[in-house]
């Protein structure tokens, strides 16, 4: 959850909610009674910005949360890493029937980086996210969290950027970290030929042809 947040060299981060200074200020619909930005303390006494919703008593929940616009920087496939807590409905009294244990992840490609509203029908569903059996127990300052981590990928992307959205249908969720990244093959030298940083293709198995150049003091 915390720390210097060093990621693998072949991953380029497009969004990291944990690195944002100040409030995240994402767009929620409805404006009140749904997703709420809540700060909690990490073990270094600095705030972690989370988004939370927990309307487990009320039926027919449809709460949306949308990120700011995310540039794709030429990536055709991006990865979304979500760290979250999701409370077991069995541990909550009197919520059977209304309490859920999943949420939905969506995306919407756009060239417009200033869309002000959430239009649900524009979004394409990536997946339904559930709490995995495996979780990391994290002791953050004055509280303990059971943190689930799920990674999904989406592509091929073609527009300048995209928005992510999270739909709650009646669960008790805290989104603790959202990171969006793409993968690249780092600069490589083979047989005196140098090949530049290269963004991976639209599929994980795609081959991307790149032109190399001779290293210094060598020639073709």
């Amino acid at each position: 959850v915390t720390g210097s947040r060093v990621y693998p060299a072949n991953e380029v981060t497009l969004l990291d909610s944990r690195s944002v200074q100040g409030e995240l200020g994402w767009i929620a619909s409805p404006l009140e009674g749904g997703w709420e930005e809540v700060s909690i303390m990490d073990e270094k006494n600095t705030p972690i910005r989370t988004y939370q919703v927990c309307n487990v008593m009320e039926p027919s929940q449809n709460n949306w949360l949308r990120t700011d616009w995310i540039t794709r920087e030429g990536a055709q496939r991006v990865y979304i890493e979500i760290k979250f807590t999701l409370r077991d409905c069995n541990s909550l009294p009197g919520v059977m029937g209304t309490c859920k244990e999943t949420f939905n992840l969506y995306y919407y490609e756009s060239d417009n980086d200033k869309e002000r509203f959430i239009r649900e029908n524009q979004f394409v569903k990536i997946d339904t996210i559930a709490a995995d059996e495996s979780f990391t127990q994290v002791d953050i300052g004055d509280r303990i969290m059971k943190l689930n981590t799920e990674i999904r990928d989406v592509g091929p992307l073609s527009k300048k950027g995209f928005y992510l959205a999270f739909q709650d249908v009646g669960a008790c969720i805290a989104l603790v970290s959202v990171r969006v990244f793409y993968k690249k093959c780092p600069l490589t030298v083979r047989n005196l030929a140098q090949f530049p940083d290269t963004i991976t293709g639209a599929d994980t198995s795609s081959l991307v042809e790149v032109r190399g150049s001779c290293v210094n003091n060598s020639e073709e």
Partner: antibody, heavy 124, light 107 residues
């Protein structure tokens, strides 16, 4: 229903020890940590610390390190507060209160259920 | 440690009055704050959590507001059963200290 029932009032002499119990019912004991709060006569509430009901690990506020011990007997869903070497200034009502052991968001992050309080009087 | 300063320490009011109690934290507690009501000889009862959210079963005349270091509990129209002592408590790093309390008395 969910409740925390504490042991009865105690009258002790200075230097003695006392053990206050807090019996939980109506919920899974290990789903909630147990906290202790002191209220001296005519005074406000003081948070003393808490005990992890899964591991038994206690955490004490600075003013309550040394003579105060939190413990558990999970087989009977009971938390205990023991005070040794009692002093006149330990005279107070002691409350137990629960909060979820794991943080799932602010919706349940507060003391929702309290014991009725145990009065401990220290007097010679 | 974070200090919680409540004001006033006591107040006299009549039934139907609007009552405001404030709580100031010594540093930003990011709305990690609860309000409790306590009557003589009884355990505290939760009124408001996360600074602004009314607890289940609490009458709508109670409301919480604030952010950063400054928080307020408001009773819009004081009722006879509201005469009690009110405490704020922060949840931003242990120790989770309480304010010193505000006693609401009948004028």
């Amino acid at each position: 229903q969910v409740q925390l029932v504490q042991s009865g009032s105690e009258l002790k002499k200075p230097g003695a020890s006392v053990k206050v119990s807090c019996k939980a019912s109506g919920y899974t004991f290990t789903d909630y940590s147990m906290h202790w709060v002191r209220q001296a006569p005519g005074q406000g509430l003081e948070w003393m610390g808490w005990i992890n009901t899964e591991t038994g690990e206690p955490t004490y506020a600075d003013d309550f390190k040394g003579r105060f011990v939190f413990s558990l007997d999970t087989s009977v869903s009971t938390a205990y507060l023991q005070i040794s070497s009692l002093k006149a200034e330990d005279t107070a009502v002691y409350y137990c209160a629960r909060i979820p052991l794991y943080y799932y968001g602010s919706r349940y992050w507060y003391f929702d259920v309290w014991g009725q309080g145990t009065t401990v009087t220290v007097s010679s | 440690d974070i200090q919680m300063t409540q004001s006033p320490s006591s107040l006299s009011a009549s039934v139907g009055d609007r009552v405001t109690i404030t709580c100031r934290a010594s540093e930003n507690i990011y709305r990690n704050l609860a309000w409790y009501q306590q009557k003589p000889g009884k355990a505290p009862k939760l009124l408001v959590y996360a600074a602004t959210n009314l607890a289940d079963g609490v009458p709508s005349r109670f409301s919480g507001s604030g952010s950063g270091t400054d928080y307020t509990l408001t009773i819009s129209s004081l009722q006879p059963e509201d005469f009690a002592t009110y405490y704020c408590q922060h949840f931003w790093g242990t120790p989770w200290t309480f304010g010193q309390g505000t006693k609401v008395e009948i004028k």
